[in-house]
């Protein structure tokens, strides 16, 4: 294999915590998103599995505000507006990366963290377990 | 906002780039997820707005593999298995943070990037525009 020369333009890593601790540029680059993307718009109201968005706020985390979806019904909404309990509203979840201040209150020191968030809801056919 | 007192135990930040560049510990902490989470299970097949998962791979990014949802139909699947085109399958999108090496080839220098991903699909009532 070819050895990569240590690039003189790279940040210095002579740090007792290196290499677990690295430099991260927080000037966030938006790839394939506008500055103000029309995120999933008003789908939470128009969906047959509608959801409410709850604000999860933590000043020690970046991003400090995360919106969590909570399905409004156990069932799914029919065309007449009534809920069909033969179907299920379920949350679609995703693991995301966030930054957490560590040590706490330090303005420029963070740790990567993985959290599971509910992004929205979808209507699914239930799994029926038949009893013999 | 509340000013955070400079903690003497915090890493030094007297840097011309501060606070754009911060120290991040890459030992990922798992909050509220097991090491092997059961990701939204088989909802992509059981949903009335089913979706396929496509692999989006970029070795210069972390995570290198991101699974993107693409709705299978324009409409939504009815109980009889047919597609109802009076309803719409739409993607639920979320902005997520990823890491990208910057400058490229530097082993311990990264930049945060925000990308918009489709996590799954939901069935919505269409917006009907009436022409006068």
């Amino acid at each position: 294999g070819i050895a990569i020369p240590r690039n003189s333009g790279c940040p210095n890593s002579e740090d007792k915590n290196f290499p677990r601790t690295v430099m991260v540029n927080l000037n966030i680059h938006n790839r394939n998103t506008s500055t103000n993307p029309k995120r999933s718009s008003d789908y939470y109201n128009r969906s047959t599995s509608p959801w409410n968005l709850h604000r999860n706020e933590d000043p020690e985390r970046y991003p400090s505000v995360i919106w969590e979806a909570k399905c409004r019904h156990l069932g799914c909404v029919k065309a007449d507006g009534n809920v069909d309990y033969h179907m299920n509203s379920v949350p679609i979840q995703q693991e995301i990366l966030v930054l957490r201040r560590e040590p706490r209150h330090c303005p420029n020191s963070f740790r990567l963290e993985k959290i599971l968030v509910s992004v929205g809801c979808t209507c699914v056919t239930p799994i029926v377990h038949h009893v013999a | 906002g509340i000013a955070i007192p400079r903690n003497s135990g915090c890493p030094n930040s007297e840097d011309k780039n501060f606070p754009r560049t911060v120290m991040v510990n890459l030992n990922i902490h798992n909050r509220n997820t097991s090491t092997n989470p059961k990701r939204s299970s088989d909802y992509y097949n059981r949903s009335t707005s089913p979706w396929n998962l496509h692999r989006n791979e970029d070795p210069e990014r972390y995570p290198s593999v991101i699974w993107e949802a693409k709705c299978r139909h324009l409409g939504c699947v009815k109980a009889d298995g047919n597609v109802d085109y009076h309803m719409n399958s739409v993607p639920i999108q979320q902005e997520i943070l990823v890491l990208r090496r910057e400058p490229r080839h530097c082993p311990n220098s990264f930049r945060l990037e925000k990308i918009l991903v489709s996590v799954g699909c939901t069935c919505v009532t269409p917006i009907v525009h009436h022409v006068a």
Partner: antibody, heavy 124, light 109 residues
Framework: QVQLQQSGPGLVKPSQTLSLTCAIS??????????WGWIRQSPGRGLEWLGR?????????DYAVSVKSRITINPDTSKNQFSLQLNSVTPEDTAVYYC??????????????WGQGTLVTVSS | DIVLTQSPATLSLSPGERATLSCRAS???????LAWYQQKPGQAPRLLIY???NRATGVPARFSGSGSGTDFTLTISSLEPEDFATYYC??????????FGQGTKVEIK
């Protein structure tokens, strides 16, 4: 707990097809948070990853470049197992073959469960 | 393909001593996708460390991993008799590239 049980012949003739099966208990071959792979080990080559399958609304296959033209990994959902087929074998394919579960979270990649290994000798 | 080079090939140490094993990649890899395995004769490899520094379930605290970019290290702080084995590093870069190092054998001096 999750276990992998390998089966298949220990002797294969040159130019023939090597076939091994890996039966899964305690997990599903269609799991959306795992991939199922084959790795082999020989004194000359060390540990060599051969390929994997994973299910994410459809089956995905990844094969090592070194064997891509000769390898097939197939799932059998009815028996909850997966198989390896390696065509046109030569004596260089003689090795201990392992099946393994790869934890396929997008944030990590590692083999946490291994089969017991099967020594396959290619000889006439 | 990325090549992983492990050194030394053999490490001769006594129980109680500290073992430092190196794994060097031919180009930068994500630490999150680097793992270490232990293998004893006649057995399948066993996962020790994933994500370069996370101990797998049931792995004793004397095992630790570190590194990023191209240089990774597995450290055994105080060798126990059962630690004498061969150790492999492995990385996933992108499909279809998953490679193993050639191994470091830790033997009793």
């Amino acid at each position: 707990q999750v276990q992998l049980q390998q089966s298949g012949p220990g002797l294969v003739k040159p130019s023939q097809t090597l076939s091994l099966t890996c039966a899964i208990s305690g997990d599903s071959v269609s799991s959306s948070s795992a991939a199922w792979g084959w790795i082999r080990q020989s004194p000359g080559r060390g540990l060599e990853w051969l390929g994997r399958i994973s299910y994410r609304s459809k089956w995905y296959n990844d094969y090592a470049v070194s064997v891509k033209s000769r390898i097939t990994i197939n799932p059998d959902t009815s028996k909850n197992q997966f198989s390896l087929q390696l065509n046109s074998v030569t004596p260089e394919d003689t090795a201990v073959y392992y099946c393994a579960r790869e934890v396929d979270s997008i944030y990590y990649s590692y083999f946490d469960i291994w089969g017991q290994g099967t020594l396959v000798t290619v000889s006439s | 393909d990325i090549v992983l080079t492990q050194s030394p090939a053999t490490l001769s140490l006594s129980p109680g001593e500290r073992a430092t094993l190196s794994c060097r990649a031919s180009q930068n890899v994500w630490a999150f996708y680097l793992a270490w395995y232990q293998q004893k004769p006649g057995q399948a490899p066993r996962l020790l460390i994933y994500g370069a520094s996370n101990r797998a379930t049931g792995v004793p605290a004397r095992f630790s991993g570190s590194g990023s970019g191209t240089d990774f290290t597995l450290t055994i702080s105080s060798l126990e008799p059962e630690d004498f084995a061969t150790y492999y590093c492995t990385q996933y870069y992108s499909s279809p590239s998953l490679t193993f190092g050639q191994g470091t054998k830790v033997e009793i001096k």
